[in-house]
Every structure is written in structure tokens, then in C-alpha cells.
Interface confidence: low
């Protein structure tokens, strides 16, 4: 903002707007009776250059003409693009104390002439929209540049609009505010953009288009779907469109999908039948429109319609497993387990399961419905039993899945051989085996079953299992496998009416146990000592314990202790040792060993045997 100059004037030659690389002469003149009051001859005019309001140069040495005390002319060169402020000041050199006094100032703009606008593109959104064009302005001019958009067409149609670019705003789009109607579909229109600033002007090449070239239909609206007879797989998609639309594109996908199903529909008139939908699935539907079969542009996609298809009756086979436990001499408890159907099989919300237990010969049948994925019943130990389970939703039930109830580990000849369990990584275990050696009936399938070896796991937690075809001899188990936990793994071989099994323990990752077993008692029986202990608490085992070690040494001895290594069995909590001298006091302790190493020692107990030495 240049204020009124009271002391004098500043002028620029050739002009205050110059092309990049040009020089300019700036003249600073004092008004009559202005200047240093006592000594006019001591008037010194200086010119200061400011860029972004920062003083960058005193142009004292650039004087090309000096009319002592009245005016000075300075030549300025190498001006950078944009605006530069020059302020002329009066320096009364006889007074060293007074700072120079501002006289007047001028702003010089350095820029370039505009390039011809290029890449003109025009659109009209919808049949009732208005024509708007955009273009590429080319290099920045650093000057206020006016742009004029001119359109001409049939019947002497002409129309123009203007805008400008400067350092605060950019002009590369204009809306002409006119509407082209479908009755002009075959007509040709021409647009041109002209750019002008203080250093020159330029014009674009003419850009020609027709109605169909530029009109983009509005996206379809009011989308809805009607499912025929509440079908989960067939539906009619309906929508509203502009009147001239002849072609639609439909896309739809389940919400968790990454790829769209695409359909082209000609002359659909706002309606299309879909026949390949998945029941009980959240879908997203979108539609786009075009005004001409071969030319023109597609509209934007419509807003999404999100809806869930109706249910249909479940399909697929339930994966069933069971456990048998004898209660007494004539009763057994059967616990049935099954896995939930996946969504594409359930085809709706499963409301309940129909469970049937049937004794084959006596035709005794127990039936029940449950909302859980397990069911337990007490039945006689006699007879041949079969179980079946089906899943039901609001539209119906799946076909029942049958399984024969056999003695799962009853036939030694069916027991798989050389079962091994190796940790593959933090969350899975590779189980391998060899087929039974002398099976008298063919193996129909293998079942690999596992559960955590923790107190109460049999009653608290259902088993996990995998069904393996009869020609496979390995399984990678990962469901619910956690590191530092020991699992009991059983491999069952099942024939039509018999079962055999082998068992092993395994873990996916292990560490040495946190502590050793706690010795609870030492008793002497028939010249042998029985050591009793409590097992290490489950969280402190940190994997499968392979064996326990019992250490002992004479109380005050510095010699290495003796030790006895016992294979780990969950059911065992005492062990005899017989190599201790009578009437000698010993110190005893225990440790536990996993594949990762040995635990710290458990508690120490002292004991002095009384009997004869062996």
C-alpha cells in the first residue's frame, strides 16, 4: 500500500511492469520547497530495495543521473520474478543524527507474457447442468493475467466469461452458465481461451465438441432392490435415471470383498435382475449411466446401496466329533461336539441344532435341540450307537451329518505308529505319524485331536480336532495353539466300526520351567525311600516337561550330588530311590526339564534313612 507522497515523486521507465531480464530506470524527484531545510545542495537521495518487506539492497552505487539536491535516477537490473518495492529516501548529510526520511516509493512487477492456454476440457453435468471448461495456463506469469473463455455454436450462439490469475488466486476454470439441450445433440461448438497481461497476450487453439462429447449424466439415484419371493440369491435392482440414458453399468460386491462383479445393461429403464447373489450376505451396489452406446462419458458412480440378502436354508456338512467316558459297568457318557458352519454354508443366522442319538438294533432314539455346539448324554454301554446333527436357520435345516459312536482307542491294531509332534513356529505344531501296521479293516479317516494339559481342561474346554484323509500322514495344528503351553495330542485312526489311537505331548515354543517340583514327603518302606512331590503349577511349566530329576547328597558334603531321572507322567507323583546309606543325613531336591532346559531346583528336604543299606 503506497501512501500519498508528500516530499516528492518516484517514476519508472520504461514502465512499472517489465519482462524478466529487463532493466529499469527509477527517478526520484523532490517537490518544490522540499528537502533539507538549510542546505539544499546537501540533499542526498538514496534508493532502497525491499523484497517481501525486507531491505535487501541500498542502490547508492547504481545512480545514472544526479541533479544535485533535486532528483536522482538509478538503474536497476537482475530483478527477480514478482514484485519488488523501491523506497526513495532523503538523507540530509549535514546532520549525522537524523535518519534518512522516506520520500516516496514504487513497486516494480517482473513477469512474463502468458503462454497459449492448452488442454481445454469442457463438461456439462446432467441434462440440466451448465457448461464449464478448464484449461492448462502454462508457466506462471507472476503478473495479474486476465483469461477470457469464448464459446460459439449454431444459430449465432456466442457467449463469454472472464476471470484473472494473480499471486492469490489461479484462474483455470470457468462456468459459462449456459445449458446445452439434447436437441443440439449433433451440433458442433467451439471454445477458445485468450490470456492477456501487461506484457502480452496469447490464444489457445480452438477446441471443438458436440453435446454428447461433454454431457456427463448425473449418477443414478433412489437405488433399491427387491428380492423375488424373499429369495437370498435373486433380486431386482431398481433406480432412477435421467431421461436420455441408454446404457448402465452395474457393479456389486460383498462388503468384505476386494473385487467387483460388473454388468452392462442396455435400455434397462431403471431395472435389472441379478441371479447370482449369496444368501445372508451384506452387499454394496452402485450404478453408472451413459447417454450414448458408443460415444459420451460415463456418469460418476451412484451412492452405494448397502443391504443384506435374505436367508436360505443351510447347506453343507457339519464337522462332528465326540468323547466317550464310562460312568459305571453299564452306563457311558457321550459328549458330542461340532464346528459352526461357515457363512456361505449357514446362509443365515443359525437358530439351533437338531441332535439325534440312535441305538441301531433296538431303535432307541434320543432327540434334542440346542443352541450350543456341544451336547452330552448318558446312554447304556451296550448296543451300537450313531449320532446325527443338523443346523437350522429361519428358512430350514441342513441335511443331518451322521457319525458312528465307536470305542475311539479300543483297537490296538488300528493305533497309528511313530507319532511325533514338532514345533514349527510360535503358534503351530506339526504332527506326523505312520499308518497302523496290521489293521484288519481299512482306515476311513484320521482325526488329530488336541487340548491343553492344564487342570480341568477335559471338563472345562471342548477338544480341538482336524479331520485328515486316510492317505495323509501329517497335520499342522494351529487353532488355539499358544506358546509355552503343553498340549496332549491324539491321532485317531477310524474304520467303519472301530477306532485306534496314539497319544503324544507337544508344544509350539518352550522355555526351561520357572521352578522345580515341590517335595511334599519322604517316606521309608522296606529299605527304600519314596519321594513324593506336587507338580509345578501349570503357568510355570512353560512347555512340555520331558522328565523330572531327583538330586541328593550328604548334608555337609561338597561333592557333586547324585541324581535319578524319571520319565514325566502326569499321573505319577512319587518315586522310589534305594542307594542311600542308613543313619546318614541327606539333602534332597528336584528339578524339571523341558526341551529348552532344566528348571531351578525346587525346595530342599533333609532325611536320614534308618533301615539297612542295600
Amino acid at each position: 500500500n503506497i501512501d500519498v507522497c508528500k516530499l516528492g515523486t518516484v517514476t519508472v521507465q520504461p514502465a512499472p511492469v517489465i519482462p524478466l531480464g529487463s532493466a529499469a530506470n527509477i527517478s526520484c524527484s523532490l517537490n518544490p520547497k522540499q528537502g533539507c531545510s538549510h542546505y539544499p545542495s546537501s540533499n542526498e537521495l538514496i534508493l532502497l530495495k525491499f523484497v517481501n518487506d525486507v531491505l535487501v539492497e541500498n542502490l547508492h552505487g547504481k545512480k545514472v543521473h544526479d541533479h544535485t539536491g533535486h532528483s536522482s535516477t538509478f538503474q536497476v537490473t537482475n530483478l527477480s520474478l514478482g514484485m519488488t518495492l523501491f523506497v526513495c529516501k532523503l538523507n540530509c548529510s549535514n546532520s549525522q543524527k537524523k535518519p534518512p526520511v522516506p520520500v516516496c516509493g514504487v513497486e516494480i512487477s517482473v513477469g512474463v507474457a502468458p503462454e497459449p492456454p492448452q488442454n481445454i476440457s469442457c463438461v456439462q453435468e446432467g441434462e440440466n447442468g451448465t457448461v464449464a471448461c478448464s484449461w492448462n495456463s502454462g508457466k506462471v506469469t507472476y503478473l495479474k493475467t486476465n483469461y477470457t473463455l469464448q464459446l460459439s455454436g449454431p444459430n449465432n450462439l456466442t457467449c463469454q466469461k472472464q476471470c484473472f490469475s494473480d499471486n492469490r488466486q489461479n484462474c483455470n476454470r470457468l462456468d459459462l452458465g449456459i445449458n446445452l439441450s439434447p436437441d443440439l445433440a449433433e451440433s458442433r461448438f467451439i471454445v477458445r481461451v485468450t490470456a492477456i497481461n501487461d506484457l502480452g497476450n496469447s490464444s489457445s487453439l480452438p477446441h471443438t465438441f458436440t453435446f454428447l462429447d461433454i454431457v456427463i449424466p448425473l449418477p443414478p439415484w433412489d437405488i433399491r432392490i427387491n428380492f423375488l419371493n424373499a429369495s437370498g440369491s435373486r433380486g431386482t435392482l431398481q433406480w432412477e435415471d435421467e431421461g436420455q440414458v441408454v446404457l448402465n453399468q452395474l457393479r456389486y460386491q460383498p462388503l468384505n470383498s476386494t473385487s467387483w462383479n460388473m454388468v452392462n445393461a442396455t435400455n434397462a429403464k431403471g431395472k435389472y435382475d441379478l441371479r447370482d447373489l449369496r444368501p445372508f450376505t451384506e452387499y454394496e451396489f452402485q450404478i453408472s449411466s451413459k447417454l450414448h452406446l458408443s460415444g459420451g462419458s460415463w456418469s460418476n458412480w451412484s451412492e452405494s446401496l448397502r443391504t443384506r440378502t435374505p436367508e436360505e436354508e443351510p447347506v453343507g456338512i457339519l464337522d462332528i466329533w465326540y468323547m466317550k467316558q464310562d460312568i459305571d459297568y453299564d452306563r457311558q457318557q457321550i459328549s458330542l461336539f461340532w464346528k459352526s458352519l461357515n457363512p456361505s454354508e449357514a446362509r443365515g443366522k443359525i437358530l439351533h441344532y437338531q441332535v439325534t442319538l440312535q441305538e441301531v438294533t433296538k431303535k432307541t432314539t434320543l432327540q434334542n435341540t440346542t443352541r450350543h455346539t456341544s451336547w452330552t448324554r448318558v446312554i447304556p454301554r451296550t448296543g451300537a450307537w450313531t449320532a446325527s446333527v443338523s443346523a437350522a436357520n429361519s428358512k430350514g435345516a441342513s441335511a443331518p451329518t451322521h457319525i458312528n459312536i465307536v470305542d475311539l482307542c479300543g483297537t490296538g491294531l488300528l493305533a497309528p505308529h511313530q507319532v511325533s509332534a514338532k514345533s514349527e513356529n510360535m503358534d503351530n505344531i506339526l504332527v506326523t505319524w505312520q499308518p497302523p501296521k496290521k489293521a484288519d479293516s481299512a482306515v476311513r479317516e484320521y482325526i488329530v485331536e488336541w487340548r491343553a494339559l492344564q487342570p480341568g481342561s477335559i471338563t472345562k474346554f471342548p477338544p480341538h480336532w482336524l479331520r485328515i484323509p486316510p492317505d495323509n500322514m501329517s497335520a499342522l495344528i494351529s487353532e488355539n495353539i499358544k506358546p509355552y503351553i503343553c498340549y496332549e495330542i491324539r491321532v485317531h485312526a477310524l474304520s467303519e466300526s472301530q477306532g485306534g489311537c496314539s497319544s503324544i505331548r507337544g508344544d509350539s515354543k518352550h522355555k526351561a520351567p520357572v521352578s522345580g517340583p515341590h517335595i511334599t514327603a519322604i517316606t521309608e518302606k522296606k529299605e527304600r525311600l519314596f519321594i513324593s512331590w506336587t507338580h509345578i503349577p501349570f503357568p510355570e511349566q512353560r512347555g512340555c516337561i520331558l522328565h523330572y530329576r531327583i538330586y541328593w547328597k550328604e548334608r555337609d558334603s561338597t561333592a557333586q550330588p547324585e541324581l535319578c531321572e524319571i520319565q514325566y507322567r502326569r499321573s505319577q507323583n512319587s518315586h522310589p530311590i534305594s542307594s542311600l546309606q542308613p543313619r546318614v543325613t541327606y539333602v534332597l531336591w528336584m528339578t524339571a526339564v523341558t526341551a529348552a532346559g532344566e528348571s531351578p531346583q525346587g525346595n530342599e528336604r533333609e532325611f536320614c534313612p534308618q533301615g539297612k543299606a542295600n
Partner: nanobody, 120 residues
Framework: QVQLQESGGGLVQAGGSLRLSCAAS????????MGWFRQAPGKEREFVAG??????QYRDSVKGRFTISRDDAKNTVYLQMNSLKPEDTAVYYC???????????????WGQGTQVTVSS
Amino acid sequence: QVQLQESGGGLVQAGGSLRLSCAASGRTFSWYRMGWFRQAPGKEREFVAGWYGVLTQYRDSVKGRFTISRDDAKNTVYLQMNSLKPEDTAVYYCAASLGGNYRSYEYDYWGQGTQVTVSS
């Protein structure tokens, strides 16, 4: 040597106006570039508006709302503040310099400041 004293601050509703004055002592007031700065709690002092002979300048966020003017006969510089916003709340300082622009360390003389509070 110049002494500066601001006045005119106060509490005002958003959208309201205030006029700050800065009175200077000394006979050479007309030689000095005058500036207004402000400092909100916990923030650095920032340039608001300045007058340098033929040139006035403003920070972008106050352009069109604030106007700086001066009366050399009264040795006073003014800041007219219209359409005030809550973010304009700060202590406003008047400053004088023989050659500075908009950096606060270039100013030689400062007033004590006046509090402006804009409530929403």
C-alpha cells in the same frame, strides 16, 4: 530516545471492534517505523501490522480487518481492529524502529502492552 505507551485494550465479543492507541514521547517520532505485535499465552510474539513512511503492511490473518494509521502531529500510532475473532486474543505491543521491518528483534523500543480478549 522514544517512550511508548499503549491503551484501548479490553474485553469484546467476537465480531466487535477495538481501537488501540500508542502514544510516543520525543520530537523525532516521524522518523521511526512503527509496528504492532501481539503475544498469546504460550506462543511467540508475532508481527501484526506496520507503517514505514510510504508502506503499510499486515499479517495475512488480519488483512481487511485491521488498519494501522499514524498522526505525527500527536505522536500517536493507531490500530483499528474490526471483526475480531477469539484467536485475536493476546497482549498487543507497540514498537518503534529506525530501520526494522517485521522481525521483532529489529525493533529498538517497546511499550508495556495492552490486553485484548475476544470472547465467543
